[in-house]
C-alpha cells in the first residue's frame, strides 16, 4: 500500500480483502503487473 506518488513499494503485501484477481484487474504500471506474475509464479 502507501498511496503516494513517491512511494517505492508497489503493493508488496496483499491488502485486506485484496485478491490476485483484483490486483490484476486494477494494475496500471508495468511494475505492478510484474508483481502480479511474480505472485503467480510463487504460488505454483
Amino acid at each position: 500500500g502507501g498511496g503516494g506518488s513517491k512511494h517505492k513499494c508497489f503493493r508488496k503485501d496483499l491488502e485486506q480483502n485484496e485478491t490476485l484477481e483484483s490486483i490484476m484487474s486494477t494494475a496500471e504500471s508495468e511494475e505492478e503487473l510484474k508483481r502480479y506474475f511474480y505472485y503467480l509464479e510463487g504460488s505454483k
Epitope: 500500500g1 502507501g2 498511496g3 503516494g4 506518488s5 512511494h7 508497489f10 503493493r11 490484476m24 484487474s25 486494477t26 494494475a27 496500471e28 504500471s29 508495468e30 511494475e31 505492478e32 503487473l33
Partner: antibody, heavy 119, light 107 residues
Framework: QVQLVQSGGGVVQPGRSLRLSCAAS????????MHWVRQAPGKGLEWVAV????????HYSDSVKGRFTISRDDSKNTLYLQMNSLRAEDTAVYYC????????????WGQGTLVTVSS | DIQMTQSPSSLSASVGDRVTITCRAS??????LAWFQQKPGKAPKSLIY???SLQSGVPSKFSGSGSGTDFTLTISSLQPEDFATYYC?????????FGGGTKVEIK
C-alpha cells in the same frame, strides 16, 4: 522533465465524434497507466477513464462508458480519448494525467484541451 | 462509488491567515487521498498525496492530515499566490472521485 502536451479539442455537434491526444515525454511512457479527467465550465473535476501499461486494463466512469474509448500508442508515446455520440454535458476541459500505479496520486497533468458540444 | 464532501465550498481570508479545508469520504479510504490546487484557466497542481505527504517542490506551508474518512488541508500562512480553488481526491478505488472544491478568496 515530464511533459504532457494535449491536442484535438474543438467545437463539435451533438452526436458527432472527436479524438483527443496527449503526447508524453520525459518519462518511460510505456511503463505507466494514464488517465483522463475532465472539468465542465465552472464545475469541479471528474475522472473519466484510465488505461494501464500495455492497454491490459481499461476502466471508465459510468457517464462515458460505451461512448468513449481510451487507447495508447506506445511507439508514439501518445494517449488518446476517442469520444463518440457526444452530448452537451460532455462539454468540458479534458486533462490527461499520469500516476505511478494503482493507488498512487497523480504527479503530472496535461495543460488541458476544451471540448465544446453544441449545435 | 465513494462520495467526497468538501467544506466549506468557499471562504474569504486575508494574507497571513491560517486556513483549513476539510474533506470527508463516504467510506474509509485509508490514506489514499490527494489535494490539488487549481487557478483559473490552469491545470490542477498536485500538492499532497497519501493524505499528508508533500509533493516535490510544494512549500511546507501546505500540510495535510487524516486517515479513514476525515481529512484536512491546512495552509499555515496564506500568501497572495495561494488564492485558488482546492480539491481533494480519493484514489482508493475506481471510479476515482473528487470533492466539489473550495474556493479561497481574498477578504
Amino acid at each position: 522533465q515530464v511533459q504532457l502536451v494535449q491536442s484535438g479539442g474543438g467545437v463539435v455537434q451533438p452526436g458527432r465524434s472527436l479524438r483527443l491526444s496527449c503526447a508524453a515525454s520525459g518519462f518511460s511512457f510505456s511503463s505507466f497507466g494514464m488517465h483522463w479527467v475532465r472539468q465542465a465550465p465552472g464545475k469541479g473535476l471528474e475522472w473519466v477513464a484510465v488505461i494501464s501499461y500495455g492497454g491490459i486494463n481499461k476502466h471508465y466512469s459510468d457517464s462515458v462508458k460505451g461512448r468513449f474509448t481510451i487507447s495508447r500508442d506506445d511507439s508514439k508515446n501518445t494517449l488518446y480519448l476517442q469520444m463518440n455520440s457526444l452530448r452537451a454535458e460532455d462539454t468540458a476541459v479534458y486533462y490527461c494525467a499520469k500516476r505511478e500505479g494503482y493507488r498512487y496520486a497523480y504527479d503530472y497533468w496535461g495543460q488541458g484541451t476544451l471540448v465544446t458540444v453544441s449545435s | 462509488d465513494i462520495q467526497m464532501t468538501q467544506s466549506p465550498s468557499s471562504l474569504s481570508a486575508s494574507v497571513g491567515d491560517r486556513v483549513t479545508i476539510t474533506c470527508r469520504a463516504s467510506q474509509g479510504i485509508s490514506n489514499y487521498l490527494a489535494w490539488f490546487q487549481q487557478k483559473p484557466g490552469k491545470a490542477p497542481k498536485s500538492l499532497i498525496y497519501g493524505a499528508s505527504s508533500l509533493q516535490s517542490g510544494v512549500p511546507s506551508k501546505f500540510s495535510g492530515s487524516g486517515s479513514g474518512t476525515d481529512f484536512t488541508l491546512t495552509i499555515s500562512s496564506l500568501q497572495p499566490e495561494d488564492f485558488a480553488t482546492y480539491y481533494c481526491q480519493q484514489y482508493n478505488s475506481y471510479p476515482l472521485t473528487f470533492g466539489g472544491g473550495t474556493k479561497v478568496e481574498i477578504k
